[in-house]
Interface confidence: medium
């Protein structure tokens, strides 16, 4: 019986010769469990595994811990890939994280972290980041050192106010911190002075809710 080719991430997919952007089936490290992910094969040389996308407000991001763990939405549209998969993947080897942002005025910016990984669920999928470059602010809008992940039903932030409940969405909240790319989606002309929107403080300030965001990862040695 012919052995089926499995892909760990979109870099594997790209290296196999499949260089068209789209949805591919990826396999968890050291497991047969599978997940579907959107592979961006064009941005900066391709091979990017998309772990989050916001673009139109079609998906509710005010989800439970379990939903953020396993992922939700459609990889071709708005979605969260899943903390468990991302944690397992990013603990296998060194990954970079690229966050691409778009505002309502047509401007685009990005933040690139040269080293990214998530702790295991035991440690609440705490985010670890090093080496920020890019155009979306000189200071990291994801608080450093990294925080545990919080959702509406699992509060691990550093605020008495319970950030996930107030800001909506699951995120690595501090108290509550300068970002939340999983906040409420606000349409154009309703996107300012919004405390609970899609926020990246060191690019657009505190009250501005973004039009579109993509978070994607790729092995550092790609």
């Amino acid at each position: 019986k012919e052995e089926q080719i499995t892909f760990r991430d979109c870099a594997d997919v790209f290296r196999s010769g499949l260089t068209t952007s789209g949805i591919y089936t990826l396999t968890f490290p050291n497991s047969t469990e599978e997940t579907k992910a959107y592979c961006d094969m064009e941005t900066g040389g391709g091979g990017w595994t998309t772990i989050q996308r916001r673009e139109d407000g079609s998906v509710d991001f005010q989800r439970t811990w379990k939903e953020y763990k396993v992922g939700f939405g459609n990889p071709s549209g708005e979605h969260w890939l899943g903390n468990e998969f991302v944690s397992q993947l990013t603990n296998q080897q060194r990954y970079v994280l690229k966050i691409h942002l778009r505002d309502w005025e047509g401007n685009e910016a990005y933040s690139l972290y040269e080293h990214f990984y998530l702790s295991s669920e035991e440690f609440n999928y705490r985010i670890h980041l090093k080496g920020l470059t890019g155009t979306a602010g000189k200071i990291s809008s994801i608080s450093q050192p990294g925080n545990d992940f919080s959702t509406k039903d699992a509060d691990n932030d550093k605020c008495i106010c319970k950030c996930s409940q107030m800001l909506t969405g699951g995120w690595w909240f501090d108290a509550c911190g300068p970002s939340n790319l999983n906040g409420m989606y606000y349409p154009q002309r309703q996107n300012t002075n919004k405390f609970n929107g899609i926020k990246w403080y060191y690019w657009k300030g505190s009250g501005y809710s973004l039009k579109a965001t993509t978070m994607m990862i790729r092995p550092a040695d790609f």
Epitope: K152, D153, K162
Partner: antibody, heavy 117, light 107 residues
Amino acid sequence: EVQLVESGGGLVKPGGSLRLSCAASGFTFSNYWMNWVRQAPGKGLEWVAEIRLKSNNYATHYAESVKGRFTISRDVSKNTVYLQMNSLKTEDTAVYYCTDTAPFAYWGQGTLVTVSS
Amino acid sequence: DIQMTQSPSSLSASVGDRVTITCKASQDVGTDVAWYQQKPGKAPKLLIYWASTRHTGVPSRFSGSGSGTDFTLTISSLQPEDFATYYCQQYSSYPLTFGGGTKVEIK
């Protein structure tokens, strides 16, 4: 519709005990930290205690004035939060309100606790 | 503990007046401040949180401002139903503390 209904208040002698209950409905109780706030007759508001979630190991915080005497707890299966009050003092006389996570959007109607000999 | 000092403790005003209540924190609380309205025999109602965000259903005549240690609640045009006692609260650190209250009475 969100509802918080307190019960268990009443007249008690100094040194006595009471257990207040707060039954919650209309929201996902298990997702909210819960608090007790009290108001002495003709006075302002005073925060008393807070209990967090299962994911926080039901961590608690107390005002210094009640620490060691009052215990906050919750029963998720009954959507109820409790305040066990022991060694009551006359200065504990107040209306006790059950509320949600700070800042407090949901309030009960309050239950009056009178500590008097 | 963080003290929240509210002033004035009471004020008299007429319908249509602009009313300003201030609250001073004894140390920096960022914007972790809420304002409540309470009428006699009733539970308090949340008006403003995070210093300036109006709670759902609160009329636009109520506004909050400030950060750090100095906070203000403004009622732009006082209505008959606004005569009540107002409290500020900090939720930046434990113990959570309230101001002493400001009673707004009819002149």
